[in-house]
Interface confidence: low
């Protein structure tokens, strides 16, 4: 699988779309997971409704939502109030039994908010309670990784 890059602005919402063959994946629930390291496991973030026929209903886990257009074959994930720690490699998955097929590998990049005048050295700590606006759709900038581009920077 090639990796598709989705860029969003910190503090705004980012929408990720994962197209798939609706016939091939008929009857399957879907999931959004975060890759832990280049060869590590993919940790489930959120999955579609337990009843496949209700997959069109938006399911939330924290600030991440997922909804599935099972007829059109498009899985949509919304990351609300995007933060720097949301950056990383993710997967859209199709679930069958204990197995999961990768629909798309996604690299989420978080761009600095041009209207945010905080010092670049300020850190955002997960777990702080924050209010956030409703998840209105933002236009995502999407591109495929070029041949040889590495989604994980080498560790020193």
């Amino acid at each position: 699988h090639n990796t598709t890059v989705f860029q969003g602005v910190a503090g705004q919402s980012l929408q990720v779309s994962c197209p798939y063959d609706s016939m091939k994946h008929w009857g399957r629930r879907k999931a959004w997971c975060r890759q832990l390291g280049e060869k590590g496991p993919c940790q489930r973030v959120v999955s579609t409704h337990n009843l496949w026929l209700l997959s069109f209903l938006r399911a939330w886990n924290g600030s991440t939502a997922i909804t599935d257009d099972t007829l059109g074959g498009t899985l949509t994930i919304t990351l609300r109030n995007l933060q720097p720690h949301d950056a990383g490699l993710y997967q859209c998955q199709s679930l069958h039994g204990s197995e999961a097929d990768t629909l798309r590998k996604v690299l989420v990049e978080v761009l600095a908010d041009p209207l945010d005048h905080r010092d670049a050295g300020d850190l955002w700590f997960p777990g702080e309670s924050e209010s956030f606006e409703d998840a209105h759709v933002e236009h995502s900038i999407s591109r495929s990784l070029l041949e040889g581009e590495i989604p994980f920077p080498p560790t020193s």
């Epitope: 063959d21 016939m23 091939k24 008929w26 679930l95 069958h96 039994g97 197995e99």
Partner: antibody, heavy 123, light 112 residues
Framework: QVQLQQSGPELVKPGASLKISCKAS????????MNWVKQRPGKGLEWIGR????????NYNGEFRVRATLTADTSSTTAYMQLSSLTSEDSAVYFC????????????????WGQGASVTVSS | DVVMTQTPLSLPVSLGDQASISCRSS???????????LHWYLQKPGQSPKLLIY???NRFSGVPDRFSGSGSGTDFTLKISRVEADDLGVYFC?????????FGGGTKLEIK
């Protein structure tokens, strides 16, 4: 009507490779999983793996993963299974079998089977 | 892998009798989507297997209503209400809830 026509019987030597074909007709070949199943004489059925011809996606049974390769040619609507490093344990009848067309709740049963391809591995 | 265990190995019956075959799986066959992918096949001598029942209890097209499937979770049963000569052969249960797909060892239905 749905038909799966497999290649004929094969006699091969130990250590050799072999490619079996399964010509499909009467349905949308590229959008249905094709399975391969092994049956040794007088024995049960073993699932080798499956291929989705539309994009070449495959799943294999662990013990066949190293020596079996599943491919499909959508232009000729033909699925293939290649077996390498054959031994006498590979002497069997090999079936191709289509998964029941994916409709709500009706997926994943093998509704149409080829007639089987008999393989004998002997020196 | 899911292990499928069929009983009995051989089932001698008289024509017109009822036959019952049991299939047990080593783990639940309920899929995350709520469906249970347990199927039954009949293989007659010298032929390829034929689908009889899919998803526990659904008869495949052309299969007579003498054949019925039941069960849930890990325990399943195929019943043939009035056995005919054409029903003789080896019956296999199979699961496709989890990859790899697996089959039971087979039950040979034969004339008593």
């Amino acid at each position: 009507q749905v038909q799966l026509q497999q290649s004929g019987p094969e006699l091969v030597k130990p250590g050799a490779s072999l490619k079996i074909s399964c010509k499909a007709s009467g349905y949308a070949f590229s959008s249905s999983w094709m399975n391969w199943v092994k049956q040794r004489p007088g024995k049960g059925l073993e699932w080798i793996g499956r291929i989705y011809p539309g994009d070449g996606d495959t799943n294999y049974n662990g013990e066949f993963r190293v020596r079996a390769t599943l491919t499909a040619d959508t232009s000729s609507t033909t699925a293939y299974m290649q077996l390498s490093s054959l031994t006498s344990e590979d002497s069997a009848v090999y079936f191709c079998a289509r998964l029941l067309r994916n409709q709500p709740g009706e997926s994943y049963a093998m509704d149409y089977w080829g007639q089987g391809a008999s393989v004998t591995v002997s020196s | 892998d899911v292990v499928m265990t069929q009983t009995p190995l051989s089932l001698p019956v008289s024509l017109g009798d009822q036959a019952s075959i049991s299939c047990r799986s080593s783990q639940s066959l309920v899929h995350s989507n709520g469906y249970t992918y347990l199927h039954w096949y009949l293989q007659k001598p010298g032929q390829s297997p034929k689908l009889l029942i899919y998803k526990v209890s659904n008869r495949f097209s052309g299969v007579p209503d003498r054949f019925s499937g039941s069960g849930s979770g890990t325990d399943f049963t195929l019943k043939i209400s009035r056995v005919e000569a054409d029903d003789l052969g080896v019956y296999f249960c199979s699961q496709s809830t989890r990859v790899p797909y697996t089959f039971g060892g087979g039950t040979k239905l034969e004339i008593k």
